[in-house]
Protein backbone atom coordinates (compact mmCIF):
# COMPACT_ATOMS: atom_id res chain seq x y z
CA UNK A 1 0.00 0.00 0.00
CA UNK A 2 1.44 3.35 -1.06
CA UNK A 3 2.25 5.73 1.77
CA UNK A 4 0.08 8.77 1.09
CA UNK A 5 2.50 10.87 3.12
CA UNK A 6 4.98 10.61 0.25
CA UNK A 7 2.72 13.01 -1.65
CA UNK A 8 3.25 15.75 0.92
CA UNK A 9 5.60 18.42 -0.47
CA UNK A 10 8.48 20.19 1.23
CA UNK A 11 7.16 22.77 3.68
CA UNK A 12 4.56 20.40 5.08
CA UNK A 13 4.34 17.44 7.43
CA UNK A 14 2.13 14.37 7.45
CA UNK A 15 0.93 12.29 10.36
CA UNK A 16 -0.16 8.70 9.63
CA UNK A 17 -2.19 8.64 12.84
CA UNK A 18 -4.84 10.84 11.28
CA UNK A 19 -6.28 11.57 7.86
CA UNK A 20 -3.24 11.49 5.59
CA UNK A 21 -3.24 15.06 4.42
CA UNK A 22 -0.33 17.43 4.54
CA UNK A 23 -0.28 20.29 7.01
CA UNK A 24 1.93 23.38 6.77
CA UNK A 25 5.02 23.56 8.94
CA UNK A 26 4.40 25.89 11.88
CA UNK A 27 6.34 29.18 12.04
CA UNK A 28 10.10 28.81 12.53
CA UNK A 29 10.13 25.22 11.33
CA UNK A 30 10.77 23.56 7.98
CA UNK A 31 10.77 20.35 5.99
CA UNK A 32 13.23 20.38 3.12
CA UNK A 33 11.96 17.19 1.49
CA UNK A 34 8.55 15.71 0.79
CA UNK A 35 6.91 13.02 2.87
CA UNK A 36 8.16 14.27 6.23
CA UNK A 37 6.38 13.16 9.43
CA UNK A 38 7.51 16.25 11.30
CA UNK A 39 8.95 19.67 10.60
CA UNK A 40 12.37 20.52 12.00
CA UNK A 41 12.93 23.63 14.11
CA UNK A 42 14.80 26.34 12.23
CA UNK A 43 18.40 26.94 13.18
CA UNK A 44 18.88 30.24 15.01
CA UNK A 45 22.03 32.23 14.28
CA UNK A 46 22.78 33.81 17.64
CA UNK A 47 25.83 34.97 19.59
CA UNK A 48 28.94 34.63 17.44
CA UNK A 49 26.74 33.43 14.56
CA UNK A 50 24.95 35.75 12.14
CA UNK A 51 22.27 34.87 9.60
CA UNK A 52 23.48 34.35 6.06
CA UNK A 53 20.15 32.99 4.79
CA UNK A 54 16.82 33.20 6.57
CA UNK A 55 14.89 30.05 7.37
CA UNK A 56 11.87 29.23 5.23
CA UNK A 57 9.23 26.55 5.44
CA UNK A 58 11.28 24.47 2.99
CA UNK A 59 14.89 25.17 4.00
CA UNK A 60 16.85 25.72 7.18
CA UNK A 61 18.58 28.97 8.06
CA UNK A 62 22.26 29.25 7.18
CA UNK A 63 24.73 30.95 9.51
CA UNK A 64 28.02 32.78 9.15
CA UNK A 65 30.30 34.05 11.89
CA UNK A 66 30.34 37.63 13.08
CA UNK A 67 33.35 39.83 12.35
CA UNK A 68 36.47 38.60 14.13
CA UNK A 69 35.48 34.93 13.81
CA UNK A 70 35.48 32.34 11.04
CA UNK A 71 33.43 29.21 10.35
CA UNK A 72 34.52 25.70 11.22
CA UNK A 73 32.80 22.40 10.53
CA UNK A 74 30.03 21.38 8.19
CA UNK A 75 27.42 24.10 7.65
CA UNK A 76 29.40 26.47 9.88
CA UNK A 77 28.65 24.48 13.01
CA UNK A 78 31.26 26.40 15.02
CA UNK A 79 32.88 29.83 15.03
CA UNK A 80 36.56 30.19 15.87
CA UNK A 81 38.27 33.45 16.78
CA UNK A 82 40.37 35.12 14.08
CA UNK A 83 44.02 35.92 14.75
CA UNK A 84 46.27 38.33 12.87
CA UNK A 85 48.50 37.16 10.07
CA UNK A 86 51.68 35.90 11.69
CA UNK A 87 49.77 34.33 14.56
CA UNK A 88 47.96 31.11 15.44
CA UNK A 89 45.16 30.37 17.88
CA UNK A 90 46.19 28.43 20.99
CA UNK A 91 44.30 27.56 24.17
CA UNK A 92 45.68 30.78 25.64
CA UNK A 93 44.58 32.92 22.69
CA UNK A 94 46.46 34.26 19.66
CA UNK A 95 50.23 33.75 19.76
CA UNK A 96 52.93 34.91 17.34
CA UNK A 97 54.40 32.29 15.04
CA UNK A 98 57.71 30.89 16.27
CA UNK A 99 60.85 31.71 14.27
CA UNK A 100 60.98 29.56 11.18
CA UNK A 101 57.18 29.37 10.81
CA UNK A 102 54.57 31.62 9.23
CA UNK A 103 50.81 32.05 8.81
CA UNK A 104 49.52 34.25 6.01
CA UNK A 105 45.85 33.91 7.07
CA UNK A 106 43.65 34.95 10.01
CA UNK A 107 42.95 31.30 10.74
CA UNK A 108 44.84 28.04 10.92
CA UNK A 109 48.25 27.21 12.35
CA UNK A 110 51.77 28.47 11.74
CA UNK A 111 53.55 26.35 9.12
CA UNK A 112 57.30 25.92 8.64
CA UNK A 113 59.02 27.99 6.01
CA UNK A 114 59.81 26.14 2.81
CA UNK A 115 63.25 24.54 2.87
CA UNK A 116 64.61 25.79 -0.43
CA UNK A 117 67.72 23.58 -0.27
CA UNK A 118 65.56 20.45 -0.42
CA UNK A 119 64.73 21.43 -4.00
CA UNK A 120 68.31 22.46 -4.66
CA UNK A 121 67.30 26.12 -4.64
CA UNK A 122 68.52 29.13 -2.76
CA UNK A 123 66.59 31.60 -0.62
CA UNK A 124 65.69 34.63 -2.70
CA UNK A 125 63.51 36.40 -0.09
CA UNK A 126 63.70 35.62 3.59
CA UNK A 127 60.59 34.39 5.38
CA UNK A 128 58.71 36.31 8.06
CA UNK A 129 55.97 35.45 10.55
CA UNK A 130 53.45 36.42 7.88
CA UNK A 131 55.12 35.18 4.70
CA UNK A 132 56.92 32.06 3.49
CA UNK A 133 60.41 32.32 2.06
CA UNK A 134 60.70 32.80 -1.68
CA UNK A 135 63.03 30.29 -3.29
CA UNK A 136 65.22 31.45 -6.15
CA UNK A 137 67.37 29.70 -8.73
CA UNK A 138 69.72 27.00 -7.53
CA UNK A 139 73.31 28.08 -6.85
CA UNK A 140 74.35 26.14 -9.96
CA UNK A 141 72.06 28.31 -12.07
CA UNK A 142 73.99 31.37 -10.88
CA UNK A 143 77.47 30.01 -11.86
CA UNK A 144 79.24 31.53 -14.91
CA UNK A 145 78.52 29.81 -18.21
CA UNK A 146 75.21 28.42 -17.09
CA UNK A 147 72.75 28.61 -19.97
CA UNK A 148 69.62 30.53 -19.20
CA UNK A 149 66.94 32.06 -21.36
CA UNK A 150 67.17 35.20 -19.25
CA UNK A 151 70.57 35.81 -17.74
CA UNK A 152 70.50 36.35 -14.00
CA UNK A 153 71.00 39.85 -12.68
CA UNK A 154 74.63 40.54 -11.85
CA UNK A 155 75.45 39.60 -8.31
CA UNK A 156 76.49 42.42 -6.06
CA UNK A 157 78.20 42.38 -2.75
CA UNK A 158 76.68 44.58 -0.06
CA UNK A 159 78.28 48.01 0.10
CA UNK A 160 79.68 47.87 -3.44
CA UNK A 161 78.27 50.18 -6.05
CA UNK A 162 78.04 49.03 -9.65
CA UNK A 163 80.93 49.95 -11.90
Amino acid sequence: LQDLCSNCPAGTFCDNNRSQICSPCPPNSFSSAGGQRTCDICRQCKGVFKTRKECSSTSNAECDCISGYHCLGAECSMCEQDCKQGQELTKKGCKDCCFGTFNDQKRGICRPWTNCSLDGKSVLVNGTKERDVVCGPSPADLSPGASSATPPAPAREPGHSPQ
Epitope: P9, G11, S23, P24, P27, S56, S57, S59
Partner: antibody, heavy 114, light 107 residues
Protein backbone atom coordinates in the same frame (compact mmCIF):
# COMPACT_ATOMS: atom_id res chain seq x y z
CA UNK B 1 11.15 43.56 5.43
CA UNK B 2 8.51 41.00 4.47
CA UNK B 3 5.70 42.52 2.41
CA UNK B 4 2.59 41.03 0.83
CA UNK B 5 0.44 43.32 -1.30
CA UNK B 6 -2.92 42.14 -2.66
CA UNK B 7 -4.66 43.70 -5.64
CA UNK B 8 -7.45 42.98 -8.09
CA UNK B 9 -10.48 43.33 -5.84
CA UNK B 10 -13.56 45.30 -6.79
CA UNK B 11 -17.29 45.18 -7.46
CA UNK B 12 -18.52 42.30 -9.60
CA UNK B 13 -21.96 40.91 -10.43
CA UNK B 14 -23.05 37.44 -9.30
CA UNK B 15 -21.75 34.85 -11.74
CA UNK B 16 -18.86 37.10 -12.71
CA UNK B 17 -15.11 36.60 -12.41
CA UNK B 18 -12.14 38.33 -10.79
CA UNK B 19 -8.44 37.59 -10.57
CA UNK B 20 -6.64 38.56 -7.39
CA UNK B 21 -2.87 39.01 -7.20
CA UNK B 22 -0.47 39.04 -4.28
CA UNK B 23 2.98 40.56 -4.80
CA UNK B 24 5.58 39.26 -2.34
CA UNK B 25 8.89 40.82 -1.35
CA UNK B 26 11.43 40.70 1.47
CA UNK B 27 11.68 36.90 1.61
CA UNK B 28 12.45 33.96 -0.67
CA UNK B 29 8.97 33.53 -2.13
CA UNK B 30 9.83 30.29 -3.95
CA UNK B 31 10.64 28.60 -0.61
CA UNK B 32 7.23 29.20 0.98
CA UNK B 33 3.81 27.74 0.44
CA UNK B 34 1.09 30.38 0.34
CA UNK B 35 -2.51 30.74 1.52
CA UNK B 36 -5.54 32.83 0.66
CA UNK B 37 -7.75 33.65 3.65
CA UNK B 38 -10.89 35.79 3.53
CA UNK B 39 -13.00 37.76 5.95
CA UNK B 40 -16.61 38.74 5.25
CA UNK B 41 -17.57 42.23 6.54
CA UNK B 42 -17.94 42.08 10.34
CA UNK B 43 -17.26 38.35 10.39
CA UNK B 44 -14.41 35.98 11.28
CA UNK B 45 -11.57 34.51 9.25
CA UNK B 46 -12.13 31.78 6.65
CA UNK B 47 -9.31 29.87 4.99
CA UNK B 48 -9.78 29.66 1.20
CA UNK B 49 -6.86 27.91 -0.46
CA UNK B 50 -3.24 26.74 -0.20
CA UNK B 51 -0.48 26.17 -2.76
CA UNK B 52 2.87 24.56 -1.97
CA UNK B 53 6.18 26.27 -2.68
CA UNK B 54 6.62 24.58 -6.06
CA UNK B 55 2.92 24.58 -6.93
CA UNK B 56 2.59 20.79 -6.89
CA UNK B 57 0.13 20.57 -3.99
CA UNK B 58 -3.09 22.58 -3.85
CA UNK B 59 -6.01 22.56 -1.41
CA UNK B 60 -9.33 24.41 -1.44
CA UNK B 61 -12.09 25.01 1.04
CA UNK B 62 -15.27 23.13 0.09
CA UNK B 63 -17.07 26.46 -0.30
CA UNK B 64 -14.88 27.50 -3.27
CA UNK B 65 -13.89 24.15 -4.79
CA UNK B 66 -14.54 24.04 -8.53
CA UNK B 67 -14.94 27.82 -8.75
CA UNK B 68 -11.62 29.23 -7.52
CA UNK B 69 -8.13 28.41 -8.83
CA UNK B 70 -4.94 29.23 -6.95
CA UNK B 71 -1.63 29.58 -8.81
CA UNK B 72 1.77 31.15 -8.44
CA UNK B 73 4.65 32.48 -10.52
CA UNK B 74 7.87 32.14 -8.55
CA UNK B 75 9.83 34.08 -11.18
CA UNK B 76 7.55 37.06 -10.53
CA UNK B 77 7.21 36.50 -6.76
CA UNK B 78 3.46 36.49 -7.26
CA UNK B 79 0.46 34.51 -6.01
CA UNK B 80 -2.91 34.51 -7.78
CA UNK B 81 -6.52 33.56 -7.12
CA UNK B 82 -8.79 33.21 -10.13
CA UNK B 83 -12.39 33.47 -8.90
CA UNK B 84 -15.22 32.37 -11.22
CA UNK B 85 -18.98 31.96 -10.73
CA UNK B 86 -18.87 34.47 -7.90
CA UNK B 87 -21.70 34.54 -5.35
CA UNK B 88 -22.89 37.13 -2.87
CA UNK B 89 -21.42 35.05 -0.03
CA UNK B 90 -17.94 35.46 -1.57
CA UNK B 91 -18.03 39.13 -0.58
CA UNK B 92 -15.05 39.61 1.72
CA UNK B 93 -11.62 41.08 2.21
CA UNK B 94 -9.15 38.58 0.73
CA UNK B 95 -5.74 38.22 2.36
CA UNK B 96 -2.68 36.34 1.15
CA UNK B 97 -0.39 34.84 3.80
CA UNK B 98 2.79 32.79 3.93
CA UNK B 99 2.34 29.13 4.85
CA UNK B 100 3.65 29.89 8.34
CA UNK B 101 0.59 32.22 8.51
CA UNK B 102 2.86 34.76 10.16
CA UNK B 103 2.75 37.57 7.61
CA UNK B 104 -0.46 38.76 5.95
CA UNK B 105 -1.10 41.35 3.28
CA UNK B 106 -3.34 44.34 3.91
CA UNK B 107 -6.17 42.65 1.99
CA UNK B 108 -8.24 43.50 -1.07
CA UNK B 109 -12.03 43.87 -0.93
CA UNK B 110 -14.20 41.79 -3.27
CA UNK B 111 -17.86 42.79 -3.44
CA UNK B 112 -20.31 40.55 -5.29
CA UNK B 113 -23.56 42.37 -5.83
CA UNK B 114 -26.05 43.14 -8.55
CA UNK C 1 -13.54 19.87 9.58
CA UNK C 2 -12.11 20.89 12.95
CA UNK C 3 -14.31 23.45 14.69
CA UNK C 4 -12.70 25.98 17.05
CA UNK C 5 -14.99 27.58 19.63
CA UNK C 6 -13.79 30.74 21.35
CA UNK C 7 -15.15 32.14 24.59
CA UNK C 8 -16.23 34.55 25.74
CA UNK C 9 -17.43 36.38 22.64
CA UNK C 10 -16.75 39.69 24.37
CA UNK C 11 -14.49 40.53 27.30
CA UNK C 12 -14.93 43.92 28.98
CA UNK C 13 -11.87 44.87 30.99
CA UNK C 14 -9.87 47.88 32.11
CA UNK C 15 -6.24 48.65 31.28
CA UNK C 16 -3.92 46.86 33.69
CA UNK C 17 -6.31 43.93 34.19
CA UNK C 18 -5.57 40.33 33.21
CA UNK C 19 -7.36 38.87 30.17
CA UNK C 20 -7.93 35.14 29.73
CA UNK C 21 -9.28 33.93 26.38
CA UNK C 22 -10.33 30.36 25.67
CA UNK C 23 -10.27 28.29 22.48
CA UNK C 24 -11.67 24.74 22.32
CA UNK C 25 -11.15 22.38 19.39
CA UNK C 26 -13.72 19.78 18.33
CA UNK C 27 -10.93 17.20 18.12
CA UNK C 28 -7.28 16.78 19.07
CA UNK C 29 -5.05 19.28 17.25
CA UNK C 30 -1.89 18.60 19.23
CA UNK C 31 -0.14 21.92 19.75
CA UNK C 32 -0.83 23.26 16.26
CA UNK C 33 -2.76 26.31 17.42
CA UNK C 34 -1.94 29.95 16.78
CA UNK C 35 -3.38 33.17 18.19
CA UNK C 36 -3.92 36.33 16.18
CA UNK C 37 -4.76 39.92 17.06
CA UNK C 38 -6.82 42.03 14.70
CA UNK C 39 -7.63 45.73 14.92
CA UNK C 40 -10.29 47.47 12.78
CA UNK C 41 -9.18 47.93 9.18
CA UNK C 42 -5.99 45.91 9.69
CA UNK C 43 -4.81 42.42 8.80
CA UNK C 44 -4.47 39.83 11.57
CA UNK C 45 -1.15 39.80 13.42
CA UNK C 46 0.41 36.56 14.66
CA UNK C 47 0.99 36.56 18.43
CA UNK C 48 1.44 32.92 19.45
CA UNK C 49 2.22 29.78 17.44
CA UNK C 50 2.60 26.16 18.48
CA UNK C 51 0.17 26.90 21.33
CA UNK C 52 2.78 28.58 23.53
CA UNK C 53 5.56 30.16 21.44
CA UNK C 54 5.60 33.94 21.28
CA UNK C 55 6.24 35.21 17.76
CA UNK C 56 9.08 37.64 17.03
CA UNK C 57 8.47 41.09 18.48
CA UNK C 58 5.41 40.13 20.52
CA UNK C 59 5.49 41.59 24.07
CA UNK C 60 6.04 39.21 26.99
CA UNK C 61 2.63 40.06 28.47
CA UNK C 62 1.11 37.74 25.84
CA UNK C 63 1.35 34.03 26.62
CA UNK C 64 -0.30 30.90 25.32
CA UNK C 65 -0.90 27.49 26.84
CA UNK C 66 -2.73 24.23 26.25
CA UNK C 67 -2.60 21.18 23.99
CA UNK C 68 -5.01 18.68 22.54
CA UNK C 69 -8.38 20.40 22.57
CA UNK C 70 -8.17 23.22 25.18
CA UNK C 71 -6.09 26.35 24.61
CA UNK C 72 -5.72 29.67 26.42
CA UNK C 73 -4.35 33.07 25.51
CA UNK C 74 -3.44 35.23 28.50
CA UNK C 75 -2.64 38.93 28.47
CA UNK C 76 -1.10 39.53 31.89
CA UNK C 77 -1.76 43.26 32.10
CA UNK C 78 -3.80 44.96 29.40
CA UNK C 79 -2.26 47.94 27.62
CA UNK C 80 -4.45 50.45 25.73
CA UNK C 81 -3.22 49.04 22.40
CA UNK C 82 -4.33 45.51 23.33
CA UNK C 83 -8.04 46.21 22.91
CA UNK C 84 -8.86 44.33 19.72
CA UNK C 85 -10.36 41.08 18.41
CA UNK C 86 -8.40 37.86 19.03
CA UNK C 87 -8.70 34.73 16.91
CA UNK C 88 -7.33 31.24 17.44
CA UNK C 89 -6.52 29.11 14.42
CA UNK C 90 -5.42 25.51 13.85
CA UNK C 91 -2.98 24.25 11.23
CA UNK C 92 -3.12 20.58 12.23
CA UNK C 93 -5.46 19.58 9.46
CA UNK C 94 -6.95 21.03 6.27
CA UNK C 95 -9.11 22.90 5.95
CA UNK C 96 -7.33 25.34 8.24
CA UNK C 97 -9.95 26.76 10.57
CA UNK C 98 -10.29 29.74 12.88
CA UNK C 99 -12.39 30.44 15.94
CA UNK C 100 -15.18 33.01 15.84
CA UNK C 101 -13.06 35.53 17.75
CA UNK C 102 -13.09 37.21 21.15
CA UNK C 103 -13.46 40.97 21.31
CA UNK C 104 -11.51 42.54 24.17
CA UNK C 105 -13.11 45.93 24.83
CA UNK C 106 -12.53 48.72 27.33
CA UNK C 107 -14.88 48.56 30.32
Amino acid sequence: EVQLVESGGGLVQPGGSLRLSCAASGFTFSEFGMHWVRQAPGKGLEWVSYISSGGSTIYYADSVKGRFTISRDNAKNSLYLQMNSLRAEDTAVYYCARDWVDYWGQGTLVTVSS
Amino acid sequence: EIVLTQSPATLSLSPGERATLSCKASENVGSYVSWYQQKPGQAPRLLIYGASNRYTGVPARFSGSGSGTDFTLTISSLEPEDFAVYYCGQSYSYPLTFGGGTKVEIK
